[in-house]
Every structure is written in C-alpha cells, then in structure tokens.
C-alpha cells in the first residue's frame, strides 16, 4: 500500500505455522447463527505471481490499477472460501496448508491458519465474513521472517574455547525480550547470567566451553506485538 494507508501487520516465521487472526465483534443475537456463516479469505501477494498451478482460474472481479509510483500488483485470489453449509473451496497448491478451525468458526473466530507459512504467503489478506444479516471484514498484512542462530566461531569447539551464539529474526524492530535456555532431558532449563554465561541482548557469550556444554541451546525472541519465535542450535564441544 501507499504510505499512510496501512493495515495491521502480523509476523510469522517461515516454515512454522502462522495464524492470521479474524475475530470480528459479532452482536450476541448473531452468535447462534454462526453455523450459517460464510467466510472468504483472499490474498494479495507482496510481489511476483502467487504460487499457483499454471492457468488456475482466479476469482472474478475487476483489475483495478495499482497506486501511483508502484508497479502492477499481483492479482488477488481466493485462498479459502467456506460457504454456509461448511462447503469449502480454495486454491491449490495452498491446500491443504490452509485451514479454518471449525470449532473456532462456530465461536466467531474466522482466523486462517497456514501450516506452514512460506515466503510466497507474504502480502495483504482480507477476510469477508457473511452472517445472516450482516457482513464483516478483517484485513491484515502478513510479513514473513527467517529465524537463525549462528555461532562464532562456527563448527566444532574444543574444551576451553570461547563461543558467541547470536539469535536473530529478520524483522526490523528489536525484540522486547530474549530468553536463553538449554534442552535437558524432558524440559527447558533457563540460562542465567553467570561467570560461564554472559547475556547481552540477542547474544550469549560462553568464555570457556566444556564437553558438558554440548547439545541443544535455544533462545526465544518475543516482540512487543506478542509474536515470539523459538530458535535452536546444536553446540558440539570435543573432549
């Protein structure tokens, strides 16, 4: 969209499930009628043609011009449509990656799930909800990021080497919090600041590793909008 006209942004991690929320305010008298509700989710990809089978029919409609100073936008298409009888139609090859929770729908939650989200899923989404006597909509922009954990120096380490682990997600704003943990047996053990572990924002500095440090290390990045991502790295320390 042009600057000054933006819809709410939802972030997701490439390769992980993504929820595109849509829970419009529905008057109480309509809640009993939700079984007859229909919902259509449509997607306007950010750039490039949507990942689709060649020649797949697109939803009917006009071909409106793009905003000034922008090139032609990929055409909108229907991702998933659920009719009043629960009849579904959608666009391959997104299916069966796209899902609506049937029980959620009967509670007025028309969120779309992408399992998993892929890079081509980025873009603007619109949901149209048809109830018996009213129509409601949800709009959002899905942005996809890549999560990674890097070790410096990379590769296997020897006892008493140092290493810095850097936890990152390709999103412009900084995380509100970073939590480090180790996977031990069945549970996660938080990593706290100590002479052996120095934490600084998204970095974890281990000044002297030992073979006991071998194994999975993880971090959880949490952003102000509530989005969080968990990233794992397998550290190898030779005896």
């Amino acid at each position: 969209l042009q600057p000054g006209a933006e819809v709410p942004v939802v972030w997701a991690q490439e390769g992980a499930p993504a929820q595109l929320p849509c829970s419009p305010t529905i008057p109480l008298q309509d809640l009993s009628l939700l079984r007859r509700a229909g919902v259509t989710w449509q997607h306007q990809p950010d750039s490039g043609p949507p990942a689709a089978a060649p020649g797949h029919p697109l939803a009917p409609g006009p071909h409106p011009a793009a905003p000034s100073s922008w090139g032609p936008r990929p055409r909108r298409y229907t991702v998933l449509s659920v009719g009043p009888g629960g009849l579904r139609s959608g666009r391959l090859p997104l299916q069966p990656r796209v899902q609506l929770d049937e029980r959620g729908r009967q509670r007025g939650d028309f969120s779309l799930w992408l399992r998993p989200a892929r890079r081509a899923d980025a873009g603007e989404y619109r949901a149209a909800v048809h109830l018996r006597d009213r129509a409601l909509s949800c709009r959002l922009r899905l942005r996809l990021g890549q999560a990674s954990m890097t070790a410096s120096p990379p590769g296997s380490l020897r006892a008493s080497d140092w290493v810095i682990l850097n936890c990152s997600f390709s999103r412009p704003d900084r995380p509100a919090s970073v939590h480090w943990f180790r996977n031990r047996g069945q549970g996660r053990v938080p990593v706290r600041e100590s002479p052996h572990h120095h934490l600084a924002e998204s970095f974890l500095f281990l000044p002297q590793v030992s073979p006991m440090d071998s194994g999975p290390w993880g971090c959880i990045l949490t952003y102000r909008d509530g989005f969080n991502v968990s990233i794992m790295y397998n550290l190898t320390v030779l005896g």
């Epitope: 006209a5 819809v7 449509q42 939803a59 149209a128 009213r134 129509a135």
Partner: antibody, heavy 120, light 107 residues
Framework: QVQLVESGGGLVKPGGSLRLSCAAS????????MSWIRQAPGKGLEWVSY????????YYADTVKGRFTISRDDAKNSLYLQMNSLRAEDTAVYYC?????????????WGQGTLVTVSS | DIQMTQSPSSVSASVGDRVTITCKAS??????VAWYQQKPGKAPKLLIY???YRYTGVPSRFSGSGSGTDFTLTISSLQPEDFATYYC?????????FGQGTKLEIK
Amino acid sequence: QVQLVESGGGLVKPGGSLRLSCAASGFTFSSYAMSWIRQAPGKGLEWVSYVTSGGDYIYYADTVKGRFTISRDDAKNSLYLQMNSLRAEDTAVYYCTRVAYDYEWYFDVWGQGTLVTVSS
Amino acid sequence: DIQMTQSPSSVSASVGDRVTITCKASQDVTTAVAWYQQKPGKAPKLLIYSASYRYTGVPSRFSGSGSGTDFTLTISSLQPEDFATYYCQQHDQSPWTFGQGTKLEIK
C-alpha cells in the same frame, strides 16, 4: 462495454408498490454481488440492499427491512428490487450497482438511476 | 452502524489548485474506504478503493491515504472537469455507509 440499465421507476402513492429492474451487460453477471443504492433529491448516497453472487446472503438497510426485497435472475442477467409499503421518504433516484467482489464491498459500476417518487 | 463524516461540506477552488477532502469514520475501518465523484444528474463514479488504490482509468492527480479512522482524498492539480461532489464510503462492514458529500465549486 460494462453496463447497468435501471427501469421501473415512477410516481406511486404512499403505501403502494413498485418493482425496479436492472439489466446487466458486458460482464459475467452471475459472478458478481449486486447492490441497490439510492439518493434522495439534493441529498447524499444511501445503501439500500445487497445480494451475493450465489444469492446465499442478502442484506438490507434498516430503513427498508421488511418492505423491500432484492432478487436476481442470472439467466436473464437481471437484478430486481420489489418495493412495498412505500413512504414519502423512499422518494429517491435508485441506482443499480455492481459490487467489486463478493468480499470487497465497494461499488465499481453504476447504472444511470431510475427516479421513484412517492407522493399522494 | 459506522458513521462517515466528511469535511468540508463544500470548498471553492481554482483550476491548478491542490485540494484535500477528509473523511472520518466513527470506528476503525482499517483501510476499507472508497471515494466516489458525482456530477449533477449523473451516477457516481468510483475513484479510489481500499483507501489508496486508484481505480482503472482514474487520473493520477487523484490520490487517497489514511487508515483506521482518518482518510483523505487529494486532487493534486484541479482540472475543470473535477468540479463535482465527492463522497467517501466505508466498505469494512454492512450496512455500508457514505459520507454526506463534499461539493467542490469553482472559485
């Protein structure tokens, strides 16, 4: 070219009935949601009624609910508005409009309008 | 129902002027606002949809912006054919509602 042509307007007494028709051409009528919008003389625009492409959902403005009925005949490429129990405040130019998408509710094609006058 | 309030109700301007019309929604409609132009005795014509997208064939001097509750239609350089009445409309939810209109007159 894409065209909508309304007919059926005229002078009617309060409490009377009228049926407006809209003939569509130049596009696949059955693929589009359609709507009626009216404009009282010298006033602004008021949405009246809407029907989805498949006819699954029909909506009315509170001001006409129970008195007006929207319908469509895809075989005839036609949209209708049956208006009963007409009141003086229903006096307006009635426009037949195409809804851009079933799920995107702005109006991209308008007919020329037909005038309905309710007066004794 | 969502109320759409346009301002000003009328504006006088000259050819070549830059004109801005605003529309305020009574609740958040994200970017679901359209703008129409209507000339006397004629049907309205769609100019802008989804707050900022120009409809097919609409000259580039027309632009829209805004999100949430505040929206703007801008005509960068008025042409003689632009003198008309302009309406905003929310297309977020039914009942679909219009602003009361802004009449753009020649100064």
